[in-house]
Interface confidence: low
């Protein structure tokens, strides 16, 4: 969840333990779940733009209040605006609620480029295009924040969808899926599929614009075209995988592949870009350089600060390679790849000098924390949450943005050897300063 | 019921600073949702909103007062105040208090407001 | 900084008769505008937010509609307490919260 080239977040909440619970085993495998009934309520449930990122209305309290919430895999805290800012239209008022409680509590959350301060208390929650469903969830009502609320995104607060061991302010706050899958029969799975628009959007068309789904609970099959491949979950915390490979037009990178999840690899939709480890990201902008030779672009643009611009409708796309990350599959020695076209990895903006030529960002960038597959990886792809079976799986997004010539790809089964050696163990002294 | 109450003096000479104060009964200035906020209207004319103050003293300003206004905070008295330095002639209106409610930043709660003059 | 541009600047009408009064954003600001009222002498009171929801206490004779960049009040049948100032306001962008110059609705 970054800022500017990262969006907000990148730490969360979660809950203490909470009374209200239906009897359910709650590590209770779901069926097949797009086999469960139709999920056309909750399709075209999202709105947004992977720079500002993809949010779901849901409503808090009693009476309900209505909400716009950043939904990030990348982070555990369930925070929403309580407090008026100038670039909120809404926000939670806690004295208006009946079913409000405090839990006498305060969280801080810091991160790179700002911070979100608030006060712990639960309440009762829904998502109206979701499940019929109402939990009391922990919220933090962000009192106070620097660079954390984004001009323009329309949305309010954040849906931190990963685990309670990065949820802040430790691991005892239950996240919101958390309470959802105990308080109710919801299966223990969420699925994403984020559709970039290929163009840059003006306020009013990001308002008016389809952004994509979350099912709750399942799969919906009319979201993704091909087949589905699971890759596990490493360890439940982020949403930690294991990259194996990674190829550039065809041409394998050639690094240890421990090199590729330094210090680890997270699916992450509050993050924009793709962002790669330091040698990991030179050994790559190198390749797509010199695939791309044929047109020269300056520094500015491979370190994602420039736009670069072409004549509306002239963009060459075909000069630009496709990417594969390769992910370790479910069956011992077996990987498949995921492949994004340039659609997904030149972020279109919106340039106001030009604004009769197409321009765009170059939206995979350096990290120093592992690698993101934010969401100009996910833009490309249908993406399940299984967290009952501690897999993600990956198809191709029926949405996604791509030209005559090729498409995203998730292709597979291929033989790779000694996967688990790519899996970066991170010394347990680190763990303590994660992400601030 | 919450109310707001403005005072201060009716009258400052140009150049000098003008001073008022908000007082909020019938709650408390400190519960988080509520922004508090100064709007001003010159006689005859519209209104000009001059900035807001969130209980921790965080502040938001006019740009076009930016410089001159500061808006503070007393939760212990429950009041807010606003200072406006180098008044002229121009800055003669009726100053309001308000609160931003509803969950969104409209002004939900007027006080009853003050007229000041600013007159040698 | 976001205009609010009022139209028209009066508007005379008699008890019983419809009001419909514009507001035009110099740039869209989605759904997010007020209507207050002001009587002479008065602060002015909320009566409409997020263009279309009245506040609490406002009869069912005010409504608001628009988004984007232009914007209704309507006072379905004037009541002789309805005669007074309206100003519309944004928040779509801030600071500043900018207000429209006002229309002045007045016996005819």
């Known amino acids: 969840t970054q800022h500017g080239i990262r969006l907000p977040l990148r730490s969360g909440l979660g809950g203490a333990p909470l009374g209200l619970r239906l009897p359910r085993e709650t590590d209770e495998e779901p069926e097949e779940p797009g086999r469960r009934g139709s999920f056309v309520e909750m399709v075209d449930n999202l709105r947004g733009k992977s720079g500002q990122g993809y949010y779901v209305e849901m409503t808090v309290g009693s009476p309900p209040q209505t909400l716009n919430i950043l939904v990030d895999t990348g982070s555990s805290n369930f925070a929403v605006g309580a407090a008026p800012h100038p670039f909120l239209h809404r926000y939670y008022q806690r004295q208006l609620s009946s079913t409000y409680r405090d839990l006498r509590k305060g969280v801080y959350v810091p991160y790179t480029q700002g911070k979100w301060e608030g006060e712990l208390g639960t309440d009762l929650v829904s998502i109206p295009h979701g499940p019929n469903v109402t939990v009391r969830a922990n919220i933090a009502a962000i009192t106070e924040s620097d660079k954390f609320f984004i001009n323009g995104s329309n949305w309010e607060g954040i849906l931190g969808l990963a685990y309670a061991e990065i949820a802040r302010p430790d691991d005892s706050l239950e996240p919101f899926f958390d309470s959802l899958v105990k308080q109710t029969h919801v299966p223990n799975l969420f699925s994403l599929q984020l559709c970039g628009a290929g163009f840059p959007l003006n306020q009013s068309e990001v308002l008016a614009s389809v952004g994509g789904s979350m099912i709750i609970g399942g799969i919906d099959h009319s979201l993704y075209t091909g087949s589905l491949w699971y890759t596990p979950i490493r360890r439940e915390w982020y949403y930690e995988v294991i990259i194996v490979r990674v190829e550039i037009n065809g041409q394998d990178l050639k690094m240890d592949c421990k090199e590729y999840n330094y210090d680890k690899s997270i699916v992450d939709s509050g993050t924009t870009n793709l962002r790669l480890p330091k040698k990991v990201f030179e050994a790559a902008v190198k390749s797509i350089k010199a695939a791309s030779s044929t047109e020269k672009f300056p520094d500015g643009f491979w370190l994602g600060e420039q736009l670069v611009c072409w004549q509306a409708g002239t963009t060459p796309w075909n000069i630009f390679p496709v990417i594969s990350l390769y992910l370790m599959g479910e069956v011992t020695n077996q990987s498949f790849r995921i492949t994004i076209l340039p659609q997904q990895y030149l972020r279109p903006v919106e340039d106001v000098a030009t604004s009769q030529d197409d321009c765009y960002k170059f939206a995979i960038s350096q990290s120093s924390t592992g690698t993101v597959m934010g969401a100009v990886i996910m833009e490309g792809f249908y993406v399940v949450f299984d967290r009952a079976r501690k897999r993600i799986g990956f198809a191709v997004s029926a949405c996604h943005v791509h030209d005559e010539f090729r498409t995203a790809a998730v292709e597979g089964p291929f033989v790779t050897l000694d996967m688990e050696d790519c899996g970066y163990n991170i010394p347990q002294t680190d763990e303590s300063t994660l992400m601030t | 019921q919450l109310q707001l109450q403005e005072s201060g003096p009716g009258l400052v000479k140009p150049s000098e600073t003008l001073s008022l104060t908000c007082t909020v009964s019938?709650?408390?200035?400190?519960?988080?949702?509520?922004?508090w906020s100064w709007i001003r209207q010159p006689p005859g004319k519209g209104l000009e909103w001059i900035g807001s103050?969130?209980?921790?003293?965080?502040?938001y300003y006019n740009p076009s007062l930016k410089g001159r206004v500061t808006i503070s905070v007393d939760t212990s008295k429950n009041q807010f105040s606003l200072k406006l330095s180098s008044v002229t002639a121009a800055d003669t209106a009726v100053y309001y208090c308000?609160?931003?409610?509803?969950?969104?930043?409209?002004?939900?709660?007027w006080g009853r407001g003050t007229l000041v003059t600013v007159s040698s | 900084e976001i205009v609010l541009t009022q139209s028209p600047a009066t508007l005379s009408l008699s008890p019983g008769e419809r009001a419909t009064l514009s507001c035009r954003a110099s740039?869209?600001?989605?759904?997010?505008l007020a209507w207050y009222q002001q009587k002479p002498g008065q602060a002015p009171r909320l009566l409409i937010y997020?263009?279309?929801k009245r506040a609490t206490g406002i009869p069912a004779r005010f409504s608001g509609s628009g988004s984007g960049t232009d914007f209704t009040l309507t006072i379905s049948s004037l009541e002789p307490e309805d005669f007074a100032v309206y100003y519309c306001?944004?928040?779509?962008?801030?600071?500043?919260?900018?207000f429209g110059g006002g229309t002045k609705v007045e016996i005819k």
């Open positions: 308000a609160r931003v409610g509803h969950g969104i930043n409209y002004f939900d709660l």
């Open positions: 019938g709650g408390s200035i400190s519960w988080s949702s509520y922004y």
């Open positions: 103050i969130y209980r921790s003293g965080r502040t």
């Open positions: 740039q869209s600001v989605s759904s997010y």
């Open positions: 997020d263009a279309s």
């Open positions: 306001q944004q928040v779509y962008t801030w600071p500043p919260r900018t």
